[in-house]
């Protein structure tokens, strides 16, 4: 038997990918063990085998469809269980009646290009990727901006409280190299998280005319 | 400019079926959920149900399921909310929205019904 | 099935004067809470969502707040246009329901 304290988190990315990381205190390395959905009124069920992603803990993503299929609803329940083999047997570890529209967090977004620089300013936009069209604009984004010398850990967040998919930065230092990144969070769903940042943007402002008060 | 237009006023003998129809137009109706609400004198706003028309699923209230039933036909952007076994307390304004599913953004400007003998 | 109570039933106050109205669920719903403005004749219109968010559009005055299963939609300074019937709606458990309404009359 497994001992310990066990923790069993998921997410739903509002589309057909619901990810799961679990946790467990004094787990056994060898075991299989793996992630079971079942919706409560769909006729499919889905299997994904948790793999280890640090000494005492698990993750894998239950792939319900095609990327950009709603495959649930704000109706759905789906009882997720987290099953090892034990011997011939499968033991229930970890289970939860989770609501996908309750946990959600969104794939990070995508295609982040620059629109337009200038020596002080830069306009970026990017897109969202597999969101359900359920949020219609109720979107808000989080981003940040890396200046030379400083973490990401230091930049200050830029807040949209609305679904606008583009950003102008402003007061920047003339031909100088920056990173941009960029997330997205659902205003529904009481355990709603932010998605992962972007991929990071590497931009660089034009260099100030020579001669020039700019 | 979003809009929902329903069609006209209906009056209906009991045991009778009814057909509203919401027209819409400024938003991509393919990719939307349009939903019913009823609007009795004595009982308030009820939900209906839904229409999911990206992903082809309908959903309805408990109280209704039995006797409603919601269709689009995408390629005229008009949703339709049908109710049968009409009774006196049917008579009602019956709305179409559009809004994700959890609250309805814009109104349809209401169809009243009204069942009498 | 969720129910919402609101209180009071009809509520009289005076141009200019701040207006504070009530919704409560039957059980626990989260932030899932969202409040509509009817006037005579007309569809509702969409004020607040999830408890205290505003809609593009809807003017300042109109705020909303939570404390556990109560909430409440505050409009700050009374405009003529503001005397309506507003109803609060919750989307935590389907058949998401509406509140029986509160009628905001001139005093």
């Known amino acids: 038997a497994v001992n310990g304290t066990s923790q069993f988190t998921c997410f739903y990315n509002s589309r057909a990918n619901i990810s799961c990381v679990w946790s467990q205190d004094g787990a056994l390395q060898d075991t299989s063990c793996q992630v079971h959905a079942w919706p409560d009124r769909r006729r499919w069920n889905q299997t994904c085998e948790l793999l280890p992603v640090s000494q005492a803990s698990w993750a894998c993503n239950l792939i319900l469809g095609a990327p950009d299929s709603q495959k649930l609803t704000t109706v759905d329940i789906v009882t997720l269980r987290v099953l090892c083999r034990e011997g011939v047997r499968w033991r229930v570890m970890a289970i939860q009646d989770f609501k996908p529209f309750e946990n959600l967090r969104l794939m990070a977004p995508i295609s982040l290009q620059v629109v337009h620089v200038e020596t002080h300013r830069c306009n970026i936009s990017w897109e969202i990727s597999q969101a359900s069209h359920y949020f219609e604009r109720h979107l808000e984004f989080e981003a940040r901006t890396l200046s030379p010398g400083h973490t990401w850990e230091e930049a200050p967040l830029l807040t949209l409280k609305q679904k606008q998919e583009w950003i102008c930065l402003e007061t920047l230092t003339p031909d100088t190299q920056y990173e941009f990144q960029v997330r997205v969070k659902p205003l529904q769903g009481e355990f709603t998280t932010w998605s992962p940042w972007s991929q990071p943007l590497a931009f660089r402002t034009k260099p100030a005319a020579l001669g020039k008060d700019t | 400019e979003v809009q929902l237009v329903q069609s006209g006023a209906e009056v209906k003998k009991p045991g009778a079926t009814v057909k509203i129809s919401c027209k819409v137009s400024g938003f991509n109706f393919k990719y939307s959920l349009i939903h019913w609400v009823q609007q009795a004198p004595g009982k308030g706003l009820e939900w209906m149900g839904w229409i999911d028309n990206e992903a082809g699923e309908t959903e309805y209230a408990p109280g209704f399921q039995d006797r409603v039933t919601i269709t689009a036909d995408t390629s005229t952007d008009t949703a339709y909310m049908e109710l049968s076994s009409l009774r006196s307390e049917d008579t009602a304004v019956y709305y179409c929205?559009?809004?994700?599913?959890?609250?309805?953004?814009?109104w349809g400007q209401g169809t009243t019904v009204t069942v009498s003998s | 099935e969720i129910v919402m109570t609101q209180s009071p039933a009809t509520l009289s106050v005076s141009p200019g004067e701040r207006a504070t109205l009530s919704c409560r669920a039957s059980?626990?719903?989260?932030?899932?809470l969202h409040w509509y403005q009817q006037k005579p004749g007309q569809a509702p219109r969409l004020l607040i969502i999830y408890g205290l968010q505003s809609i593009s559009g809807i003017p300042a005055r109109f705020s909303g707040s939570r404390s556990g299963t109560e909430f409440t939609l505050t409009i700050s300074s009374l405009q003529s246009e503001d005397f309506a019937v507003y109803f609060c709606?919750?989307?935590?458990?389907?058949?998401?329901?509406f509140g029986q309404g509160t009628k905001l009359e001139i005093k």
């Open positions: 059980q626990i719903i989260s932030n899932n």
């Open positions: 709606q919750q989307s935590n458990n389907w058949p998401y329901t």
């Open positions: 929205a559009r809004g994700g599913p959890w609250f309805l953004s814009y």
